[in-house]
């Protein structure tokens, strides 16, 4: 697994650097998760042809993966810091069940999958400290998540491979959009 943020060689080589601000720490945490996703996607794409499949749209419709929309206030037009932050935290909480699903989906990158899951939990904690309106954040229902996980794990092999690919791709896109929005806050 990659070295967690704040412990990389760049930081060691630059001991006189000012301590990271809260925004920079969040930025670094997201980059770390994105690096982990890249490694997992590499294994997925090498193992199956899902990354080139034209049938992904069919499978995507059956997954309710979080996405950024204009109404979420994270894009330049209609940017709203509080609404956007709530969307990012809510979206990450919704992704947690899908990250749990990924845990048994990798052979050579098992540690990496765990690192992505754990780093996401840390990221959520960072963001919750930043949020003023925690009441607006809806936490997914554990019972619903448990049945979703069972349903996903009961899919045939092809659908499980496709689901893995789609989760990683959507999570990457969600994090990239979040990163841009958070920099404006």
């Amino acid at each position: 697994a990659p070295v967690p943020p704040g412990e990389d060689s760049k930081d060691v080589a630059a001991p006189h650097r000012q301590p990271l601000t809260s925004s920079e720490r969040i930025d670094k945490q997201i980059r770390y998760i994105l690096d982990g996703i890249s490694a997992l996607r590499k294994e997925t794409c090498n193992k199956s042809n899902m990354c080139e499949s034209s049938k992904e749209a069919l499978a995507e419709n059956n997954l309710n993966l979080p996405k950024m929309a204009e109404k979420d206030g994270c894009f330049q037009s209609g940017f709203n810091e509080e609404t956007c932050l709530v969307k990012i935290i809510t979206g990450l909480l919704e992704f947690e069940v899908y990250l749990e699903y990924l845990q048994n989906r990798f052979e050579s990158s098992e540690e990496q999958a765990r690192a992505v899951q754990m780093s996401t939990k840390v990221l959520i904690q960072f963001l919750q400290k930043k949020a003023k309106n925690l009441d607006a954040i809806t936490t997914p229902d554990p019972t619903t998540n448990a049945s979703l996980l069972t349903k996903l794990q009961a899919q045939n092999q092809w659908l499980q491979d496709m689901t893995t690919h789609l989760i990683l791709r959507s999570f990457k896109e969600f994090l990239q959009s979040s990163l841009r929005a958070l920099r404006q806050m």
Partner: antibody, heavy 116, light 107 residues
């Protein structure tokens, strides 16, 4: 190796619409923001706007009223339209990919001249 | 909009010289700054991102530093291929904005 190839009309008359297209070859189109940047002769760089593969756009407020950026994911292409051009729009127009940090891949540039 | 101001606007130097270009943002941009090199009739090329991280394939004689509003690009030992125009760019907020450029010429 991701490459961007751009094309479009190079000579326009005032009040016409500038139209350029950029195609992405050899890499993923999804998950990136795709930008247009211009550079008037002998001057610096000006960001025009960008589009995400999903169609979400961000524009430079100084040009927003005249600009439309669109995407065709089936062809891995994105396009720029700039309405009601004047001589001040004469520039080299570049398409570029914005990764999470910078414009890491650029098109070859298209010189657009506006003259009556 | 965040204004980016580079200095100097041009400089003359010799091969082997140490060259420093500065970039100032009109408001704090954390470390969300990139540096580009542009040669005549060519598209800009990314050198540094996140204020101090070197793009892969860029020679180690290039380095960046700074945070907040003040940033520096340093070329430790100028090479013939380094004569070009250099731009800084912020990506903290929209619209993305560039410095006006610094032209590095042969003395």
């Amino acid at each position: 190796q991701v490459q961007l190839q751009q094309w479009g009309a190079g000579l326009l008359k005032p009040s016409e619409t500038l139209s350029l297209t950029c195609a992405v070859y050899g890499g993923s189109f999804r998950g990136y923001y795709w930008s247009w940047i211009r550079q008037p002769p002998g001057k610096g760089l000006e960001w025009i706007g960008e589009i995400f593969h999903s169609g979400s756009t961000n524009y430079n407020p100084s040009l927003k009223s005249r600009v439309t950026i669109s995407v065709d994911t089936s062809k891995n292409q994105f396009s720029l339209k700039l309405r009601s051009v004047t001589a001040a729009d004469t520039a080299v127009y570049y398409c570029a990919r914005e990764d999470i940090d910078d414009f890491d891949i650029w098109g070859q540039g298209t010189m657009v001249t506006v003259s009556s | 909009d965040i204004q980016m101001t580079q200095s100097p606007s041009s400089l003359s130097a010799s091969v082997g010289d140490r060259v420093t270009i500065t970039c100032r943002a009109s408001q704090g941009i954390s470390s969300w700054l990139a540096w580009y090199q542009q040669k005549p009739e060519k598209a800009p090329k990314s050198l540094i991102y996140a204020a101090s991280s070197l793009q892969s394939g860029v020679p180690s004689r290039f380095s960046g530093s700074g945070s907040g509003t003040d940033f520096t690009l340093t070329i430790s030992s100028l090479q013939p291929e380094d004569f070009a125009t250099y731009y800084c760019q912020q990506y903290k907020s929209y619209p993305r904005t560039f410095g006006q450029g610094t032209k590095v010429e042969i003395k």
